[in-house]
Each structure stands twice: as C-alpha cells, then as structure tokens.
C-alpha cells in the first residue's frame, strides 16, 4: 500500500511537537529514569509482511494516543501543543488504517503477528504502571515523553523502510 507522501512529514511534525512539549530539563529528572524495555525487535522491519508491520505501527501509535488523551496527560502538558500532537497522531492512525484496508483489498493477508502486538501492549502497560507509581509527577511525565520520542523515532525508521519497499 502507499502511505501518503505527507505521512513522513506528519511523523517529523509529531516528533517536533513532542520535543516542544518538554516543560522541564531532562537533566533534572535523572533520578526518575527508567528502562521500559521498548520491544525494538518488533520494529526491525526485516521479517515483516506489510499488513502485519503496519498493524504493529498502528498499535504503537494507538497506545501513544491513548496515553496522551487521558485526564492526567491533559493536566501535565500545554493544552495547545497537546491538542496538535494528538491530532497528528490521529491523522497517522487514519493513514495506517487506510493503508491496511488497501493492502487487504489486494488479497487476504495476515493482519497481525500476535506476539508483536502483545509486546507493544505490555510495553505501554509498563509505562502506565510507572506513571501511576510516580503519581504522574512532572518528572515522570518528562521521562515518558523522552521515551515516547525514542519509540516514535524507531517506528519512523520502520515506516521509512516500508515506503522504500513499495
């Protein structure tokens, strides 16, 4: 399927907005750093057919969208930047859904690798648990923001590889 040309631009804009959302210096939150165990192997892009790969990307973006549309998130970030960020994520979700639909019309393909999807869901469960334990403190949110930037960057690499495969 063809991810729209604007999709890569949306990714970059999403990362840029997430970078702008930072409210405190990451260096002041060193004590709160945490390894969330990002399932990097699920995003290496080598073993994937397109539909399952897009399905995993969709899962990642959906979970980020879920995380940043909570009440706790609204209280933590600048409202305008958060709204723009979530709008960009939603546009990406739409692009990925349309892409899978297009792929499906070409022929029945496996929609997912269940293990990959579960790995992504567990990763976000760890993030949510961390925020809960830290009582959604500003530093906890800063650590999570930096983590999401990293995971989004890695997912962008997979999306670029998918585009090159077309």
């Amino acid at each position: 399927c063809d991810l729209p040309e604007t999709h890569s631009l949306d990714n970059r804009r999403t990362l840029m907005l997430l970078a702008q959302m930072s409210r405190i210096s990451p260096s002041s939150c060193l004590m709160d750093r945490h390894d969330f165990g990002f399932p990097q192997e699920e995003f290496d892009g080598n073993q994937f057919q397109k539909a399952p790969a897009i399905s995993v990307l969709h899962e990642l973006i959906q979970q980020i969208f879920n995380l940043f549309t909570t009440k706790d998130s609204s209280a933590a970030w600048d409202e305008d930047l958060l709204d723009k960020f979530c709008t960009e994520l939603y546009q990406q979700l739409n692009d990925l859904e349309a892409c899978v639909m297009q792929e499906e019309r070409v022929g029945e393909t496996p929609l997912m690798n269940a293990d990959s999807i579960l790995a992504v869901k567990k990763y976000f469960r760890r993030i949510t648990l961390y925020l809960t334990e830290k009582k959604y403190s500003p530093c906890a949110w800063e650590v999570v923001r930096a983590e999401i930037m990293r995971s989004l960057s890695l997912s962008t690499n997979l999306q670029e590889r998918l585009r090159r495969k077309e």
């Epitope: 969709h58 899962e59 959906q62 939603y90 990925l96």
Partner: antibody
Framework: EVQLLESGAEVKRPGSSVRVSCRAS????????ISWVRQAPGQGLEWMGR????????NYAQNFRGRITITADKSPLTAYLELSSLRFEDTAVYYC???????????????????WGQGSLVTVSS | EIVLTQSPGTLSLSPGEGATLSCRAS???????LTWYQQKPGQSPRLLIY???SRATGVPDRFSGGGSGTDFTLTISRLEPEDFAVFYC???????????FGQGTKVEIK
C-alpha cells in the same frame, strides 16, 4: 469493561429535534470512537455516525447528513446525539456503542461495537 | 457502498441442531472487518465474532465464524435454548469510516 448508560425515552413531534445522551463509565478511553446505531421497531440495525471524544472528530452516515449532530464531553465521558427535522420513520431505539481497547490488534478495535448502551426509545408522533 | 445480505431471513430449528447463517457482501470485504452480533428480544446487541473468526470474551465455542471475499458464515454447532435470537453481520470500510449491517437472520425454535 465499559458501561454505557443512555438517557430516557422521549416522545417528539414531527419536525422537532431530539437529543439523546450516553454516559460511559468503567475502563473508558476518550481515544476510541463512540457510535450511534438505531433500530426501528421490528427492523435491523443502522449506523448513524460516530465521534472521537478526545478530539471531537465526527463521521456521519450519508443518510443522516444535514440532520445529525454528534458531540461529546470528555469528563465525565459522555456522547450526545442530536437529530433534527424528525419524521415518523425516525421512531426507533437509539443505541450508543463503543469498541474495546482489549481487542488485538487495535486496528480491529474501532471496526466493531463491543459495548452497547441499553437503548433509548424515541417516538415521533403527532 | 457495501450492502450485506443475510440469508435465510428466518431459520426454524430445534435445540441440539446445528445452524449455518450466511452473510453475502456486494463487494469484497476483508474477513478482518467482518463482525457478528446476537440480539435477543428487548435487549441490546451482543458482540459474538470479530475479525471474521475470533470469538469475543465469554462467547461459547459452539459459535464459529468463517468465509472470505464476499461470502461469510456464522455456524452454531449445537443450538442451546439461549441461542435463539436475531443474528446480524456487520462490515467496516474506511476511509471515510462506514459501518454496514446486514438485515439480520432470526433463529427461532421449531
């Protein structure tokens, strides 16, 4: 588990408008769409439209465009259906319905209705 | 726009018998976006099968879904008294998002 609770039954005159509410509780996400589906007496199910409460983005079925408005509040998570220029054939049970965040992959989640309200009967009568 | 046609309109069967319900689409639908619901009189619909063949939480394994392309089936291997109801198939298409329901098949006690 998500619970959806709709407002009570309404009797309306032809040409008037009706507003039905749907309050969500439990494991709710404003990042998943809430849809409205109606069922005329003895008839099948008909999707009317949906809203993504987190952003207020709406999508409407072709049949209802121009007469339907769906809105939502994020806290408490509540969706509203407003249908104007009511006709006798709008007499139906109106359901709100939402997907499940537990269905994997999430790309399937928004394609179906895992949770349903109890339904709100709207009767259009002169 | 996709049209879903369910057949038969009514199925009269006895408890213990098997039932096969058909849902035919006017154009190709991915099985991943084909869903089945059960609705009993006076109740809201209940999710049964999604993704063409995955059972929703709490749905007994006597219910199974299958098919691809334009022809889909819901099979109930052995009807229990609580299974008699109306069954609807539903498809999803995007963009823009459109949810389409079949007109329903009523499974009644003979």
């Amino acid at each position: 588990e998500v619970q959806l609770l709709e407002s009570g039954a309404e009797v309306k005159r032809p040409g008037s408008s009706v507003r039905v509410s749907c309050r969500a509780s439990g494991d709710t996400f404003s990042s998943y769409p809430i849809s409205w589906v109606r069922q005329a007496p003895g008839q099948g199910l008909e999707w009317m439209g949906r809203i993504l409460p987190a952003l207020g983005v709406t999508n409407y079925a072709q049949n209802f465009r121009g007469r339907i408005t769906i809105t939502a509040d994020k806290s408490p998570l509540t969706a509203y259906l407003e249908l104007s220029s009511l006709r006798f054939e709008d007499t139906a049970v109106y359901y709100c319905a939402s997907p499940s965040a537990d269905i994997i992959p999430s790309i399937l989640g928004t394609t179906l209705f895992a949770f349903w309200g109890q339904g709100s009967l709207v009767t259009v009568s002169s | 726009e996709i049209v879903l046609t369910q057949s038969p309109g009514t199925l009269s069967l006895s408890p213990g018998e098997g039932a096969t319900l058909s849902c035919r689409a006017s154009q190709n639908v991915s099985r991943h976006y084909l869903t089945w619901y059960q609705q009993k009189p006076g109740q809201s619909p209940r999710l049964l099968i999604y993704g063409g063949s995955s059972r929703a939480t709490g749905v007994p394994d006597r219910f199974s879904g299958g098919g691809s392309g334009t022809d889909f089936t819901l099979t109930i291997s052995r009807l229990e008294p609580e299974d008699f109801a109306v069954f609807y198939c539903q498809s999803y298409h995007s963009p823009p998002p459109v949810y389409t329901f079949g007109q329903g098949t009523k499974v009644e006690i003979k």
